[in-house]
């Protein structure tokens, strides 16, 4: 059975040529992460293996950090960054587990944070 | 061209230590890892570890982390696997390999360790 | 991590036959499935990436298809020099490698 939940940043805005930072958490679970994989749209961005260690896709290599901790940082954004992004937790013995965060990159300086929230 | 030149077959004794090269032209070596993967005879293909030549970084699996030690020498654009205690069990072809992202693109040629007393 | 199993182990072929292979998941592999092909005493081959991407450089008599937790390799018309091991590697959940497939001369 899952008990795990997923929180995330939520739906997070920030400017053009700016960075930010991709956050999900795993909490209730006493399961073991074995993998996360960072997603856009049906795009792997960055995968962190519990053994081996983060691995970015090679698109992306100069915009995207790893971490801090499990989470991706996203440097230079462009508008076309505007979009869905997926946290994937692989566990054992769970299973997977999967967070959405919205982001959305504004032309002007208005950007800020939005709310976090949980998906069960 | 990409290559990547492996050192030649060795065959040891139980107890004692390999070690094992891997030579990269073709392309700027620091900038992609390196595994070690090896195959055992009738058995699936199993990732040893990865080093970064970049900052020397290195991960293992699990089953390695004791046993397996891997190098990288910058200056010669070399990676080296030292697999210590060997067993009869290590007995199988050890390759290196170029992951490229997330998948191996290039690999080398294979060196056969055999362990036998 | 997901466990692959490729079926079949041996296949035995003439040239010009259109040989299928395929590669199952323990569990859903989303497509970044890769296929490499071996020679005795060579170094393996990338032949198709996350799941339908040929290579560069690789004959379009080679074709890659699937979703899910199963996936195939295709050759359309086996040439001589197709005779080989194939195997499949997935990095949806660790990095785990199918045990291989065998084709040989009919």
């Known amino acids: 059975m899952m008990t795990g939940t997923i929180e995330t940043t939520g739906n997070i805005s920030a400017e053009k040529g700016g960075s930010i930072i991709l956050q999900c958490h795993l909490s209730s679970t006493t399961a073991q992460v074995t993998q996360v994989n960072w997603e856009q749209q049906d795009q792997l961005l960055a995968i962190c293996n519990a053994d081996l260690g983060w691995h970015i896709s090679p698109s992306f290599k100069d915009r995207v950090a790893p971490g801090p901790g499990l989470g991706l940082t996203l440097q230079s954004l462009t508008v076309n960054d505007t979009g869905e992004y997926f946290c994937i937790y692989h566990t054992y013995p769970d299973g997977t587990y999967t967070g959405r965060i919205f982001l959305e990159v504004l032309e002007s300086s208005v950007a800020e944070h939005g709310a976090r929230f949980q998906i069960p | 061209e990409v290559q990547l030149v492996q050192s030649g077959a060795e065959v040891k004794k139980p107890g004692a230590s390999v070690k094992v090269s891997c030579k990269a032209s073709g392309y700027t070596f620091t900038e992609y890892s390196i595994y070690w993967v090896r195959q055992a005879p009738g058995q699936r293909l199993e990732i040893i570890g990865r080093i970064d030549p970049k900052n020397g970084r290195t991960y293992y699996v699990d089953k390695f982390k004791n046993r397996a030690t891997i190098t990288a020498d910058t200056s010669a654009s070399t990676a080296y696997m030292e697999l210590s205690s060997l067993r009869s069990e290590d007995t199988a072809v050890y390759f290196c390999?170029?992951?490229?992202?997330?998948?191996?693109?290039?690999w080398g040629q294979g060196t056969l360790v055999t362990v036998s007393s | 991590d997901i466990q692959l199993t490729q079926s079949p182990s041996f296949l035995s072929a003439s040239v010009g036959d259109r040989v299928t292979i395929t590669c199952k998941g323990s569990?859903?592999?989303?497509?970044?499935l890769v296929w490499y092909q071996q020679k005795p005493g060579k170094a393996p081959k990338l032949l198709i990436y996350n799941t339908d991407n040929l290579q560069s450089g690789i004959p379009s008599r080679f074709s890659g298809s699937g979703s899910g937790t199963e996936y195939t390799l295709t050759i359309s018309s086996l040439q001589p020099e197709d005779f080989a091991t194939y195997f499949c590697y997935q990095y949806n959940n660790g990095f785990t490698f199918g045990q291989g497939t065998k084709v040989e001369i009919k």
């Open positions: 390999t170029r992951i490229y992202g997330f998948y191996f693109d290039f």
């Open positions: 569990q859903n592999v989303n497509k970044y």
